[in-house]
């Protein structure tokens, strides 16, 4: 799969493949994988992809299920790239404060915060 | 500050304190702090709080600016707790796939994805 495919298209295709292969994937009844308790998904990318790795190692490969795991690995690559961009640019305090304000604003409005 | 204060109220108060103390905080003209290039904030919590630590170490403490940094450390504590909850519960493959589908769905609709 060329990495040139836009990430948004990759995510859409992966959702479809996940649906298609659900029956095959859940065949292993003894396998247990960590599942986050909350819905702040971005905080849990590491655990999600560790889980995907566990699932892949237990799944018979071939056909489009292989494409599913290939897609998921490209999505991981994209997220790793985004994580790298968290710390690459050293800016002045004014810009950091504007970003921090945005971050807290997003926490305030969009995060799923338990009381 | 009691940790019993709901996180949502803590975030609101911190936003107000950030506004109040902006002038004092930007006084250091030579300090540089990593600022993420994108707006997928949850991916960057580690770098954001490292930046806050850098800023705190360079800021004269006292009065309500101290409260600002105390609040920020409580917010960090909350986020660290959320991160711990990413891997605590081991579930069946079906539940993991449901979470993965939700994660990809959120990526598809809410993440800021560059072409």
């Amino acid at each position: 799969i060329p990495t040139e495919i836009p990430t948004s298209a990759l995510v859409k295709e992966t959702l479809a493949l996940l649906s298609t292969h659900r029956t095959l994937l859940i065949a292993n009844e003894t396998l247990r994988i960590p599942v986050p308790v909350h819905k702040n998904h971005q905080l849990c990318t590491e655990e999600i992809f560790q889980g995907i790795g566990t699932l892949e190692s237990q799944t018979v490969q071939g056909g489009t299920v292989e494409r599913l795991f290939k897609n998921l690995s490209l999505i991981k690559k994209y997220i790793d790239g985004q994580k790298k961009k968290c710390g690459e640019e050293r800016r002045r305090v004014a810009q950091f404060l504007d970003y921090l304000q945005e971050f807290l604003g997003v926490m305030n409005t969009e995060w799923i915060i338990e009381s | 500050i009691p940790t019993e204060i709901p996180t949502s109220a803590l975030v609101k108060e911190t936003l107000a304190l950030l506004s109040t103390h902006r002038t004092l905080l930007i006084a250091n003209e030579t300090l540089r702090i990593p600022v993420p290039v994108h707006k997928n904030h949850q991916l960057c919590t580690e770098e954001i709080f490292q930046g806050i630590g850098t800023l705190e170490s360079q800021t004269v403490q006292g009065g309500t600016v101290e409260r600002l940094f105390k609040n920020l450390s409580l917010i960090k504590k909350y986020i660290d707790g959320q991160k711990k909850k990413c891997g605590e519960e081991r579930r069946r493959v079906a539940q993991f796939l449901d979470y993965l589908q939700e994660f990809l769905g959120v990526m598809n609709t809410e993440w800021i994805i560059e072409s």
Partner: antibody, heavy 119, light 107 residues
Framework: QVQLVQSGAEVKKPGASVKVSCKAS????????INWVRQAPGQGLEWIGY????????RYNQKFKGRATLTVDKSTSTAYMELSSLRSEDTAVYYC????????????WGQGTLVTVSS | DIQMTQSPSSLSASVGDRVTITCKAS??????LSWIQQKPGKAPKTLIH???RLIDGVPSRFSGSGSGQDFTLTISSLQPEDFATYYC?????????FGQGTKVEIK
Amino acid sequence: QVQLVQSGAEVKKPGASVKVSCKASGYTFTNHHINWVRQAPGQGLEWIGYINPYNDYSRYNQKFKGRATLTVDKSTSTAYMELSSLRSEDTAVYYCARDYGNFWYFDVWGQGTLVTVSS
Amino acid sequence: DIQMTQSPSSLSASVGDRVTITCKASQDINSYLSWIQQKPGKAPKTLIHRADRLIDGVPSRFSGSGSGQDFTLTISSLQPEDFATYYCLQYDDFPYTFGQGTKVEIK
């Protein structure tokens, strides 16, 4: 493709206000800051300020603080720059420009709006 | 505010010439500098960002260098479509500030 389309030319009297619009298309409006820059006839470029459509937060060049107001309408993906108490020195072409990332370079510019202040 | 001093303010050159424009910041701006091209009656266009990174679609004859306070824009072999005014912009600190511009004219 990514575009910023600005409103048409305006003629205003001294003391009046002007509101210039900048309609974004081809990308998710809330993902990028919008900057405003002006250029007086035969002169260089001058930064007015930026607005973050994500949270409506704006920052201004001190020179324009109190006179310039930056706003956005997320429902129409449009940014606005209003300048009040106009004087002849405000005669200029006003540009909107998109930040590539947070406090980053301007990767897309609007075509410009000429504002003429004359009695 | 950070002052950006550009030189020369204008220059005459021929097609094929190598052209260099410099920009000096009044304080350290790291590498947060872009170079912008503007043709008469047209909107500005960013050519280079972060001092030396060429923007997609910009011809490779344009290059930038420098960090800290001193920066350079070079056009290795001037083409007819390159006759324009060039500005440097620092986006390191608020307020962002531009150089006064360098007009590149045909000799």
